[in-house]
Amino acid sequence: MASTGLELLGMTLAVLGWLGTLVSCALPLWKVTAFIGNSIVVAQVVWEGLWMSCVVQSTGQMQCKVYDSLLALPQDLQAARALCVIALLLALLGLLVAITGAQCTTCVEDEGAKARIVLTAGVILLLAGILVLIPVCWTAHAIIQDFYNPLVAEALKRELGASLYLGWAAAALLMLGGGLLCCTCPPPQVERPRGPRLGYSIPSRSGASGLDKRDYV
């Protein structure tokens, strides 16, 4: 019963992690730059994401532009895009695998097989969480590096966007969910021999005669 609860908790966290990853990867809030206008007032804020950049004016008006050319994008951005998509697909696969092997479903009858399926799902979700972490941490590192780089103009120094924080949270949820699914897996039990401890194995009688133990009084 406790393992069923852990499974449900793990899957819930993984679903939240998947949704968080989806939102984080989709939103253009990876890098944020504020441009100061006349009278030291923030005139524009530029948001940059994996798929588009947006400019938000002081009036509140926002305009976004989707990156039209893949070739014009830096390689790290292309890699971040790819990792995000792979992580989303992998997490989805992990969730589907987890549902297949969950205690509360009857897709698989064999308990041992169920345990192995849930363990596989946990590993997949852990991997998905790591894949989300890579572009998020890489982008954060680049922003911080630029911030302390004297060759980068003050006006161009970016801040960490909300998508990065959301990405960290999503990665944590995926990994936590995956970890819990791995923990629900009972340790492999050594089967006790049915007969006396002998140095050789006794062939199964039921296999030879077609009779079961229940046939004996």
């Epitope: 730059t33 441009f35 206008g37 524009q44 400019v55 532009k65 990156y67 014009a72």
Partner: antibody, heavy 124, light 107 residues
């Protein structure tokens, strides 16, 4: 400080080709996009195109696309522009200019540092 | 292509005057407008970008404003060294386009 040093003036015959250079210093060459701008005598500014030195990706003004080839050498932090099939219309000062913004694509095409210009005169 | 129109080719002014140079875009450029100053025999120099953000080292007498399609560069108190050609440019999308320029000259 940031400097863009352009090559010497060119005198060319109609139909010939010229290749000019723009050597960048004082910043990380591969981080910023390099643009080229044309200015005919007594006229305004006309954008030619840009090159992203890190990837070699180029984008051109459709009106000048067939005439221009932009390249960049990361090792020497130098951008190049080749003009082919020269006519009197190509007599102008050509500037290389660094894109100010690091914004990946869209919105950020202001040009903060400009070379001193390379004068091209096409005459028979 | 986005067309940038500077309606006035020349503007006469005196030292100490306040002067405004206007620029109109053929479509909404979402404040992605830069202003350049060019003196004879020199290359253009970036003054403002994002319509109102001053570039490093630009005196605060240069201010910019505008949104949508209409943009203005204002020099609050013209100095002798400000007599030059001023170009607006949209940095919204490629192909980048410039206005024809407005020459600021003494009365």
């Amino acid at each position: 400080q940031v400097q863009l040093q352009q090559s010497a003036p060119e005198l060319a015959r109609p139909g010939a080709s010229v290749r000019m250079s723009c050597k960048a210093s004082g910043y990380t060459f591969t981080t910023y996009t390099m643009h080229w701008v044309k200015q005919r005598p007594g006229q305004g500014l006309e954008w030619i195109g840009f090159i992203i030195p890190s990837s070699g990706y180029t984008e051109y003004n459709q009106n000048l696309k067939d005439k221009t080839t932009l390249t960049a050498d990361k090792a020497s932090s130098t951008a190049y522009m080749q003009l082919t099939s020269l006519t009197s219309e190509d007599s102008a000062v050509y500037y290389c200019a660094r894109q100010f913004s690091l914004i990946t694509t869209g919105f950020g095409y202001a040009l903060d540092y400009w070379g001193q210009g390379t004068s091209v005169t096409v005459s028979s | 292509d986005i067309v940038m129109t500077q309606s006035r080719k020349f503007m006469s002014t005196s030292v100490g005057d306040r002067v405004s140079i206007t620029c109109k875009a053929s479509q909404d450029v979402s404040t992605a407008v830069a202003w350049y100053q060019q003196k004879p025999g020199q290359s253009p120099k970036l003054l403002l970008y994002w319509a109102s953000t001053r570039h490093t080292g630009v005196p605060d007498r240069f201010t910019g404003s505008g949104s949508g399609t209409d943009y203005t560069l204002t020099i609050s108190s013209v100095q002798a060294e400000d007599l030059a050609l001023y170009y607006c440019q949209q940095h919204y999308s490629t192909p980048l386009t410039f206005g024809a320029g407005t020459k600021l000259e003494l009365k």
